[in-house]
C-alpha cells in the first residue's frame, strides 16, 4: 500500500478505496461493506468505519461512486421504486444526499435483477464520511462483483 | 499522444484508454473492442490486445469502467438475467470477476433496450489485462456510443 | 476554490465540475444545469455556459459523466426507448455523440422511474463543450441527486 502513497510524493499521496458489499442482519437502510475479495484501500488517509462509511482525512475533490444490484418484484414490493442514495456526513453538518438513482420494480418472478450506478465529483472536508442508503437492503444482491462502493481523490 | 505522456513528466505519464464496441461473429462471451470513432489510447503503456482486452504495463491503481447497452426480450431469452462482468487476468493468476451488473430482460417486443454501467478502482499488476464478459453478446447494441470500455491510471 | 487550483501547482491545477439538473420550460432536448446544491466548479478553467454545456479551457484527457433519472410509461410514450446522449462540440467541428444509453419505458403507472449513468475518458480541445441530450426532457426527474453532470481532468 505504501507504493501507492509514494507515487505522488509524501505531500500528495494517492488516496482511493473500493469496498465490497456485505449482507447484514441489521434493520438499517445503510448498506454494509467489507475489505474483502478484490478490494482497495490505498492507505490510512481513507478508512472504512463501522463497515458502513468511507471517511477521508484530507480535504479535496473526490470522485465517489457506488454500484448496487438488487432483485425485486412489483407485487411483493411497495409501490415506491427502489432508490439508492449516495450520502455525505461532514463534521458539524447534517447528512445530505449527493446522488440518487431510482428503478421501478420488475414484474419478473420471484424477482428481477437490476443494477444502479452512481458517481460524481464532490469536495470533501477532513473527517467527512460518505455512505450508501437504499430503500430495502434485503433486496440487494451480494454475489461477487454485484454491489460495491468507492472513491478516489483527484 | 505525446502531449498526454509529457503532462505529468516522463516518470508519471498519463495513462488512459477508451475503446468502442465491435460486433463479432465469434461465439465467445467476451466482448470485442476497436480503436475507432472517438476513442482514446494515451500511449503504449496501455494497449488493446486481440481486440478484447486492455493490458497495462505499469503497476498501480486504475479506475476501470464499462458500459453495455443491450436489447433483449423475456420470452426470447433464457430465464437468467443479462449479466455484464468486468474481469481481470493477471499474469500467473486466474481470471476473476471485478464487477458485475444484472438486468432482467424486458417484455418489450421485439426487444427492449437497457444500459448497464460498471466502474471501480482496482490495483493492476504489470501485464494485467481487463476485459468484459456478457451472457449473450448477440444482444449487445453497437450503435454510436452505446457500448464502450476504458480505464485511467490514478 | 483556489485551494483546488494550487494543489498541483499553477502549471497543473485541478479541473473538475459537477452540476445539478434544472427543470426547463424550453422545448429543447438539451438538458439544463445549474450551480446549485452540492455542486462543484473547481476554477475558471471549466465553466457552465448558458446553463447547458460544460466548456473547458485546456486541452487534455477528461473523465466525463452524466446521470439521468427519468419517469416514463410505455403506453404514454413513443415506441422508441428513452435515450440519454453525452455529446461534444469542439470549435470548428460538428457536434458528435460520445456516449449513449437507452432504456425501454416502464409499464408502471402513472410512470416508472429508471436511472441511466454514462461515463468515459475523452480528449477535449481548448474551448470544447460537452452537453447532455435526451429524447424527452419532460420525463427527467429533478429531485435532489437524481440527475447530474460533470467532469474531471486527468
Amino acid at each position: 500500500e505504501n507504493s501507492f502513497e509514494m507515487q505522488k510524493g509524501d505531500q500528495n499521496p494517492q488516496i482511493a478505496a473500493h469496498v465490497i458489499s456485505e449482507a447484514s442482519s441489521k434493520t438499517t437502510s445503510v448498506l454494509q461493506w467489507a475489505e474483502k475479495g478484490y478490494y482497495t484501500m490505498s492507505n490510512n488517509l481513507v478508512t472504512l468505519e463501522n463497515g458502513k462509511q468511507l471517511t477521508v482525512k484530507r480535504q479535496g475533490l473526490y470522485y465517489i461512486y457506488a454500484q448496487v444490484t438488487f432483485c425485486s418484484n412489483r407485487e411483493a414490493s411497495s409501490q415506491a421504486p427502489f432508490i439508492a442514495s449516495l450520502c455525505l456526513k461532514s463534521p458539524g453538518r447534517f447528512e445530505r444526499i449527493l446522488l440518487r438513482a431510482a428503478n421501478t420494480h420488475s414484474s419478473a418472478k420471484p424477482c428481477g435483477q437490476q443494477s444502479i450506478h452512481l458517481g460524481g465529483v464532490f469536495e470533501l472536508q477532513p473527517g467527512a464520511s460518505v455512505f450508501v442508503n437504499v430503500t430495502d437492503p434485503s433486496q440487494v444482491s451480494h454475489g461477487t462483483g454485484f454491489t460495491s462502493f468507492g472513491l478516489l481523490k483527484l | 499522444e505525446n502531449s498526454f505522456e509529457m503532462q505529468k513528466g516522463d516518470q508519471n505519464p498519463q495513462i488512459a484508454a477508451h475503446v468502442i464496441s465491435e460486433a463479432s461473429s465469434k461465439t465467445t462471451s467476451v466482448l470485442q473492442w476497436a480503436e475507432k470513432g472517438y476513442y482514446t489510447m494515451s500511449n503504449n503503456l496501455v494497449t488493446l490486445e486481440n481486440g478484447k482486452q486492455l493490458t497495462v504495463k505499469r503497476q498501480g491503481l486504475y479506475y476501470i469502467y464499462a458500459q453495455v447497452t443491450f436489447c433483449s426480450n423475456r420470452e426470447a431469452s433464457s430465464q437468467a438475467p443479462f449479466i455484464a462482468s468486468l474481469c481481470l487476468k493477471s499474469p500467473g493468476r486466474f481470471e476473476r470477476i471485478l464487477l458485475r451488473a444484472a438486468n432482467t430482460h424486458s417484455s418489450a417486443k421485439p426487444c427492449g433496450q437497457q444500459s448497464i454501467h460498471l466502474g471501480g478502482v482496482f490495483e493492476l499488476q504489470p501485464g494485467a489485462s481487463v476485459f468484459v464478459n456478457v451472457t449473450d453478446p448477440s444482444q449487445v447494441s453497437h450503435g454510436t456510443g452505446f457500448t464502450s470500455f476504458g480505464l485511467l491510471k490514478l | 476554490e483556489n485551494s483546488f487550483e494550487m494543489q498541483k501547482g499553477d502549471q497543473n491545477p485541478q479541473i473538475a465540475a459537477h452540476v445539478i439538473s434544472e427543470a426547463s420550460s424550453k422545448t429543447t432536448s438539451v438538458l439544463q444545469w445549474a450551480e446549485k446544491g452540492y455542486y462543484t466548479m473547481s476554477n475558471n478553467l471549466v465553466t457552465l455556459e448558458n446553463g447547458k454545456q460544460l466548456t473547458v479551457k485546456r486541452q487534455g484527457l477528461y473523465y466525463i459523466y452524466a446521470q439521468v433519472t427519468f419517469c416514463s410509461n410505455r403506453e404514454a410514450s413513443s415506441q422508441a426507448p428513452f435515450i440519454a446522449s453525452l455529446c461534444l462540440k469542439s470549435p470548428g467541428r460538428f457536434e458528435r455523440i460520445l456516449l449513449r444509453a437507452a432504456n425501454t419505458h416502464s409499464s408502471a403507472k402513472p410512470c416508472g422511474q429508471q436511472s441511466i449513468h454514462l461515463g468515459g475518458v475523452f480528449e477535449l480541445q481548448p474551448g470544447a463543450s460537452v452537453f447532455v441530450n435526451v429524447t424527452d426532457p419532460s420525463q427527467v426527474s429533478h429531485g435532489t441527486g437524481f440527475t447530474s453532470f460533470g467532469l474531471l481532468k486527468l
Partner: nanobody
C-alpha cells in the same frame, strides 16, 4: 462436475515432438480454467502450463515456455499440450487439471495444485536419449 481423460503419451526420442490431448466431459468446459501438470518418477507434481477460460490467456512454467504450447478447442471440449524438442528430463506422467471459473479458493495462482478441483488419471510420456 467435469471428467478429464488424457491421451497422446508414449515413447519418443530426444529432440522429437508430441501432442497431448485432454478430453473434458460433463458440464460445459467453457466455464473451466484448464492446466497441465507433470510428475517425474520420484519427484513432486509440477506446473507446466495453464489456459484461462474466457480470454484463452496462457501461463507457462518459466523453464518450459520456449518448447511447450498449451491450447484449447472449446467446440471439441479438448485441451492440448504441444511439446517440442523433448528432452529425457521431460519424462513424466502428464496430468490435465480443471477449475471452475466462478471458484474462489484460497489460492489464486495458476501454478498451484491446490487451485484445481478436477484431475485426470494422467498419460505417460517417456523421452529416450
Amino acid at each position: 462436475e467435469v471428467q478429464l481423460v488424457e491421451s497422446g503419451g508414449g515413447l519418443v526420442q530426444a529432440g522429437g515432438s508430441l501432442r497431448l490431448s485432454c478430453a473434458a466431459s460433463g458440464r460445459t468446459p467453457l466455464n473451466y480454467h484448464m492446466a497441465w501438470f507433470r510428475q517425474a518418477p520420484g519427484k513432486e507434481r509440477e506446473f507446466v502450463a495453464a489456459i484461462s477460460s474466457l480470454l484463452g490467456s496462457t501461463d507457462y512454467s518459466d523453464s518450459l515456455k520456449d518448447r511447450f504450447t498449451i491450447s484449447r478447442d472449446n467446440a471439441k471440449a479438448t485441451l492440448y499440450l504441444r511439446m517440442n524438442n523433448l528432452k529425457p528430463e521431460d519424462t513424466a506422467v502428464y496430468y490435465c487439471a480443471a477449475r471452475e471459473t466462478t471458484h474462489y479458493s484460497t489460492s489464486d495462482r495458476v501454478n498451484e495444485m491446490r487451485s484445481y478441483d478436477y484431475w485426470g488419471q494422467g498419460t505417460l510420456v517417456t523421452v529416450s536419449s
